[in-house]
Amino acid sequence: EDGGPACYGGFDLYFILDKSGSVLHHWNEIYYFVEQLAHKFISPQLRMSFIVFSTRGTTLMKLTEDREQIRQGLEELQKVLPGGDTYMHEGFERASEQIYYENRQGYRTASVIIALTDGELHEDLFFYSEREANRSRDLGAIVYCVGVKDFNETQLARIADSKDHVFPVNDGFQALQGIIHSILKKSCIEILAAEPSTICAGESFQVVVRGNGFRHARNVDRVLCSFKINDSVTLNEKPFSVEDTYLLCPAPILKEVGMKAALQVSMNDGLSFISSSVIITTTHCSDGS
């Protein structure tokens, strides 16, 4: 919406936001950070949810791809009045709950969580937060943490997937704007193109999947290329090579002319998938062509 880099990945994005008393005078900065970031995820297949936590976790906007609902959700977010304790685990519970429902529906969509907090979590609260973040991970989520001001980076590294999934903002809330680009770059997993996009019916091929963020997986050995054929059968293939901006994958042999394979990528061995609008189609190839 405001130009600059954008993310075209189709996944479920959860913002888990600290609205405890300590952020009372900084809620505007948190809101503008989320608003700016939200507008950069532009795939029509991307769904978003806003969750806030203090002494209780509340889903301010339940998972939706509807841009009007997202606009209204942002309006509700702007009106939040912070207060209470830092029960971060409650925020993760609310995300896990939604992931669980979506998995049960059969939508095995990849989930990305961006959790923001401003303080150190006392021992028991840290234990609960780590436990609930692990539950989100068990359900297939990738977890990022944004720490502002008095955060404990060691704690956040254990709540997030790794130290590389933590974004420290040491210069206070006004510096949140400065990390939007790096969060976008790290949290965005997108499929942009496939080469070739047309393959010969009945023949074996390798496909280069162009995109971004393929090495953001906790374990690159768990990355899969997935081909949803004619909107029914899904075939998963292990890539020969995983780089941040491309995957080299064996394409399934599609026997008939006119078959379509929609391209998806899993970062967790098929537990959930990043969707795209990239399609591979089959054509008739004569001998020697």
Partner: antibody, heavy 117, light 106 residues
Framework: QVQLKESGPALVKPTQTLTLTCTFS??????????VSWIRQPPGKALEWLAH???????SYSTSLKTRLTISKDTSKNQVVLTMTNMDPVDTATYYC?????????WGQGTLVTVSS | DIELTQPPSVSVAPGQTARISCSGD??????VHWYQQKPGQAPVLVIY???KRPSGIPERFSGSNSGNTATLTISGTQAEDEADYYC?????????FGGGTKLTVL
């Protein structure tokens, strides 16, 4: 298909410990995200959630009964066991086990436990 | 934990629409699930995650949730829908049930 069945004593004496077993089939407790809950319902009254065990062995308990409850699982036997100490006549109820994580999609038929001397 | 409040009873004529409410502080910010329980039987999940219907549940059952009230709606109520209905939510690692509503089909 998914099935759950509760078993245990029909009658227990006050102050005794109740042990209930839930034997299930059609799903695995080693699968991410799910779990098994115990719920009870006194005659003519509402449902009351007691305890839950997750696939990763995390446990949670009803705040009001926490000190009296223990939940455990035996994944290889497809069983979940609930023990409740210091039984009282007010604990007379039908005890159900059910599958789920954040809601309960399959229930056993329940077992009536009467607490009486 | 959140408290879920239901009316003890609701009556409806056959073929009409029954609405059963479940209220709680900012309940729209959490998810609500609904169970049907007939006498002598175990509860059956009829709606989960506010408005999703499990397979095998008739289309006449629907759910909504916003503000401080979640609602189970049964359109074209049939005699077989007479039962107790419970709302349920998840809060601080606990499952919480409402007190139940007895639906009478006149």
């Amino acid at each position: 298909q998914v099935q759950l069945k509760e078993s245990g004593p029909a009658l227990v004496k006050p102050t005794q410990t109740l042990t209930l077993t839930c034997t299930f089939s059609g799903f695995s407790l080693s699968t991410s995200g799910g779990g098994v809950s115990w719920i009870r319902q006194p005659p003519g009254k509402a449902l009351e959630w007691l305890a839950h065990i997750y696939s990763n062995d995390d446990k949670s308990y009803s705040t009001s009964l926490k000190t009296r409850l223990t939940i455990s699982k035996d994944t290889s036997k497809n069983q979940v066991v609930l023990t409740m100490t210091n039984m009282d006549p007010v604990d007379t109820a039908t005890y159900y086990c059910a599958r789920g994580g954040y809601f309960l999609d399959y229930w056993g038929q329940g077992t009536l436990v009467t607490v009486s001397s | 934990d959140i408290e879920l409040t239901q009316p003890p009873s609701v009556s409806v004529a056959p073929g009409q629409t029954a609405r059963i409410s479940c209220s709680g502080d900012n309940i729209g910010g959490i998810y609500v699930h609904w169970y049907q329980q007939k006498p002598g039987q175990a509860p059956v999940l009829v709606i989960y995650a506010d408005s999703k219907r499990p397979s095998g549940i008739p289309e006449r059952f629907s759910g909504s949730n916003s503000g401080n009230t979640a609602t189970l709606t049964i359109s074209g109520t049939q005699a077989e829908d007479e039962a107790d209905y419970y709302c349920q939510s998840y809060d601080i690692t606990s499952l919480v049930f409402g007190g139940g509503t007895k639906l009478t089909v006149l």
